[in-house]
């Protein structure tokens, strides 16, 4: 009659941190001598257990090995961790010198459950504008088993990465994923979000997410356009710069009597639109008596470190005008004025 | 003192499943170091031993009735129980519940409770 | 299976006589051996456990010897009370198997 080492279950699964119980029974108590758990096959497997008097850390005996009649040698592992992960063996040895293996348990694989590391997703380090396309990678770490999905959305519409990649491609104790897709950004993504969404079994149906604002990686330049208002008083005509829909806020407005800097002005008070973006109005009063002869009036606009944006305005002097008081203005470079 | 008392039908039709149960008192089945048995003494013969819970978890079972029985515990009723399914005129019996003692022999039995297996 | 042969199936003697019991093993169980007697209509009572040890209770006019696959069980001074039926129990292996019993009377 031969001794059976039943080892029940073909694998368990373990949450990093957790315990787990990994069953052995004996079908007889003879022949006489110990009984080991080993990590893996071979020369290179590993005693992670012996029913003897040597302490094992993290490893204890399910039920008292010193009883006459026990047939369970079953192991609880505590406080797994990654590296625990592989096949044991319970081991039945006869008594001699030296002991002598005379029959194994079939083995049980232990998969150790590690939740992969929040997402980080990482954008080109300058902003792209409108039509450009960019590149986002996710990357997550530290995960097990290794099987896993990663999923890329924008503005709740899913997209389709360039390239995934899980690695190492063998069996390792945990595993990273990387992953990088392509957006092509329009004028209204200020407000837009590109999310990237991983599930695992670690993760109970919660999927982990990495979020990229894509106000952090794209400019929309302003429109910019100069208009003159109708004279207030005969000494006085009102000009208009207007920035529209830019981003991100960082906007200079300076503006310049025939190519001098009259003004500079640091906007404070922007107006805040609902894609995100940003207007800014700048008004210029020019005192007429102060100006018989032609003006040119330009309003130069540098958004975000870019070069600046210019629009001219040319206001007529009075000695230019037979129809005294008339006003004629042009667009941004041909805007002519007869001053009183 | 620990005490064992079987429950359980005294009649049972064939095909019909058999169910038992042995409550402890004077002592906690969890409590370490036990196996808990089911026997069964067939009419005017000897004794043949079912299976046996152990008090760490394990379950052992006699092959010859390995397909249809069943053992389980229940330690907040201080009960294991044994189920046998399919049951013929063969399995007429007194069925007896045992506990291990310290030692490796079984030192507390139920009184046995006679099972009869007829239509 | 361990079968467990006992003999004899019964045996009559007379009170204050020595009674010897064997119990053979078809394969080496070590000491895993243990003893019961039962009387009609009651359960099993373990007499001796580890083929050797007397029971805590058990009057010491029983006794086990025997180790491997040869075991005996003797009562020195047969007792009226000690008529009953005896059986011996191996628990080395699985399943655990019953001898097939002895039936003591007195003559």
């Known amino acids: 009659t031969e001794v059976k080492v039943i080892q029940p279950e073909k694998s368990v699964s373990v949450a990093a941190g957790d315990s787990t119980v990994l069953n052995c029974t004996l079908t007889s108590l003879l022949p006489v001598g110990p009984i080991r758990w080993y990590r893996g096959v071979g020369q290179s497997r590993q005693l992670i257990y012996s029913f003897t008097t040597e302490h094992f850390p993290r490893v204890t005996n399910v039920s008292d090995a010193t009883k006459r009649s026990n047939l369970d040698f079953s192991i609880r592992i505590s406080n797994v961790t990654p590296e625990d992960a592989g096949t044991y063996y319970c081991v039945k040895f006869q008594r001699g010198s030296p002991d002598t293996e005379i029959q194994s348990g079939g083995g049980t694989e232990v998969y150790v459950l590690a939740k992969p590391s929040p997402p980080e997703v990482s954008g080109p380090a300058d902003r792209g504008i409108p039509d450009q396309k960019v590149n986002f990678t996710c990357k997550s770490h530290g995960f097990s088993p290794r099987n896993i999905t990663l999923k890329w959305f924008k503005d709740g519409q899913e997209l389709h990465p360039l390239e995934t990649t899980v690695n190492p491609s063998g069996k390792n104790v945990s595993y990273n994923i990387s992953s990088t897709v392509r957006v092509v950004l329009n004028s209204m993504d200020v407000n837009s979000k590109v999310i990237c969404e991983v599930a695992h079994i670690t993760l109970d149906r919660s999927p982990l997410r990495g979020i990229a604002n894509l106000s952090n990686f794209i400019r929309v330049s302003p429109t910019v356009k100069v208009t003159q208002q109708s004279p207030t008083s005969m000494n006085q005509v009102n000009l208009t710069c207007r920035a529209e829909r830019f981003y991100p806020e960082d906007l200079q407005l300076i503006w310049l009597e025939n190519g001098n800097v009259s003004r500079n002005d640091t906007p404070k008070n922007l107006t805040k639109n609902t894609d995100g973006t940003y207007n800014y109005t700048s008004l210029f009063l020019v005192n007429s008596s102060a100006h018989r002869e032609d003006v040119v009036f330009t309003c130069q606009v540098k958004h975000d470190q870019q070069p600046a944006i210019t629009r001219n305005h040319t206001v007529l002097g009075f000695a230019h005008s037979s129809d005294q008081g008339s006003m004629q203005t042009f667009p941004d470079n041909n805007a002519t004025h007869n001053w009183n | 003192q620990v005490q064992l008392q079987e429950s359980g039908p005294g009649l049972v039709k064939p095909s019909q499943t058999l169910s038992l149960t042995c409550t402890v008192s004077g002592g906690s089945i969890s409590s370490g170091g036990y196996y808990w048995s089911w026997i069964r003494q067939h009419p005017g013969k000897g004794l043949e031993w079912i299976g046996a819970i152990y008090y760490s978890g394990p379950i052992y079972y006699n092959p010859s009735l390995k397909s249809r029985v069943t053992i389980s515990v229940d330690t907040s009723k201080n009960q294991f129980s044994l189920k046998l399914s399919s049951v013929t005129a063969a399995d007429t019996a007194v069925y007896y519940c045992?506990?291990?003692?310290?030692?490796?022999?079984?030192?507390?039995w139920g009184q046995g409770t006679t099972v009869t297996v007829s239509s | 299976d361990i079968q467990m042969t006992q003999s004899p199936s019964s045996l009559s003697a007379s009170v204050g006589d020595r009674v010897t019991i064997t119990c053979q093993a078809s394969d080496d169980i070590s000491d895993y051996l243990n003893w019961y007697q039962q009387k009609p209509g009651k359960a099993p009572k373990l007499l001796i456990y580890d083929a050797s040890n007397l029971e805590t209770g058990v009057p010491s006019r029983f006794s086990g010897s025997g180790s491997g696959t040869d075991f005996t069980f003797t009562i020195s001074s047969l007792q009226p009370e000690d008529i009953a039926t005896y059986y011996c129990q191996q628990f080395a292996y699985l399943p655990w198997t019953f001898g097939g019993g002895t039936k003591v009377e007195i003559k």
């Open positions: 045992s506990k291990e003692g310290y030692h490796s022999g079984m030192d507390v």
